[in-house]
Amino acid sequence: HNTTVFQGVEGQSLQVSCPYDSMKHWGRRKAWCRQLGEKGPCQRVVSTHNLWLLSFLRRRNGSTAITDDTLGGTLTITLRNLQPHDAGFYQCQSLHGSEADTLRKVLVEVLADPLDHRDAGDLWVPGESESFEDAHVEHSISRSLLEGEIPFPPTS
């Protein structure tokens, strides 16, 4: 299985969809689990309704909800109020007996809210930077200085 990346914004909701063959997985409950380490077990977070015919009903565990469109063949997981600690590897699973087939491997990435930066407190305004071509450099995540290069001075 390839891993599908889903990106969400911190504090907002993220919907993860896992398509599957509805005939092949007919009658099977589904689950959403979190991968614990590269080779570790997949820890169950939430699963669909105990009665397969009621799989369309939303089931919730904390901020995570799951619902299954068994006819269309789409499992949907919603992560509410996404937080940095929600980032990581997950799986959508199809359950049969004590076994579980992987429907999709998922990587959840949590992006900083553009209005909720860690640098939200710096009172930056564009008008003070407008005259400096590279004023944004000091805010980039990482930047290597070339030999002999002088770091760009703060704008204020």
């Epitope: 710096d122 930056w124 930077s129 944004h136």
Partner: antibody, heavy 122, light 113 residues
Framework: EVQLLESGGGLVQPGGSLRLSCAAS????????MGWVRQAPGKGLEWVSA????????YYADSVKGRFTISRDNSKNTLYLQMNSLRAEDTAVYYC???????????????WGQGTLVTVSS | DIVMTQSPDSLAVSLGERATINCKSS????????????LAWYQQKPGQPPKLLIY???TRESGVPDRFSGSGSGTDFTLTISSLQAEDVAVYYC?????????FGGGTKVEIK
């Protein structure tokens, strides 16, 4: 739930002093710039002052520069505005507001407190 | 300092009709590095503090109904309420977030005709 609660307003004589406080809750206060905006009775909004998250930067409107001092105590989640040499034209509702923004966004005010009334009169 | 000028001072519009508020800045608030205009709009209902509606001239704050829209660039901006509702009665302010000192427009009062 994010809450900002101003206090310290009241009636003061011209030339007098007042210290306004704004108690913040429901968010990580120390991550955010904060500001004061005032509104004279029946008038529009006037930005007064702002302070960066770590208190390293402060800004003031020309109308209050040299008379007002903004400060914050991140350990107490509280913003302050020390107002000296008050004038009749400083009479207004003073709102405390969180400065939403950051690099590439620029400072906008949200959310706001309910405000505290400062009346300067003899 | 950037001076913000709003027009009209007040506006009476029938329910369901369009309301248009203008805001002009004394200098451009367009940041060339990202091509964004640093202009915000606020709504202040009677007896309440202001509420942020729009930033970057046209980006709606989450939870703001889509009947509110912002447009314009450089120095001339518009807030449009496409279909006025009773709950939209308020004073609307523009604010530049381009340069310190931050400045607000004088406000536009929107009423129902």
């Amino acid at each position: 739930e994010v809450q900002l609660l101003e206090s310290g307003g009241g009636l003061v004589q011209p030339g007098g002093s007042l210290r306004l406080s704004c108690a913040a809750s429901g968010f990580t206060f120390s991550n955010y710039g904060m500001g004061w905006v005032r509104q004279a009775p029946g008038k529009g909004l006037e930005w007064v002052s702002a302070i960066s998250a770590n208190a390293g930067k402060t800004y003031y409107a020309d109308s209050v520069k040299g008379r007002f001092t903004i400060s914050r105590d991140n350990s107490k989640n509280t913003l302050y505005l020390q107002m000296n040499s008050l004038r009749a034209e400083d009479t207004a509702v003073y709102y405390c507001a969180s400065l939403r923004g950051g690099y590439e966004v620029g400072p906008t005010f949200d959310p706001w407190g309910q405000g505290t009334l400062v009346t300067v009169s003899s | 300092d950037i001076v913000m000028t709003q027009s009209p001072d007040s506006l009476a519009v029938s329910l369901g009709e369009r309301a248009t508020i203008n805001c002009k800045s004394s200098q451009s608030v367009l940041y060339s590095s990202n091509n964004k205009n640093y202009l915000a709009w606020y709504q202040q209902k009677p007896g309440q503090p202001p509420k942020l509606l729009i930033y970057w001239a046209s980006t709606r704050e989450s939870g703001v109904p889509d009947r509110f829209s912002g447009s314009g660039s450089g120095t001339d901006f518009t807030l449009t309420i496409s279909s006025l509702q009773a709950e939209d009665v308020a004073v609307y302010y523009c604010q530049q977030h381009y340069l310190w000192p931050i400045s607000f427009g004088g406000g536009t009062k929107v009423e129902i005709k």
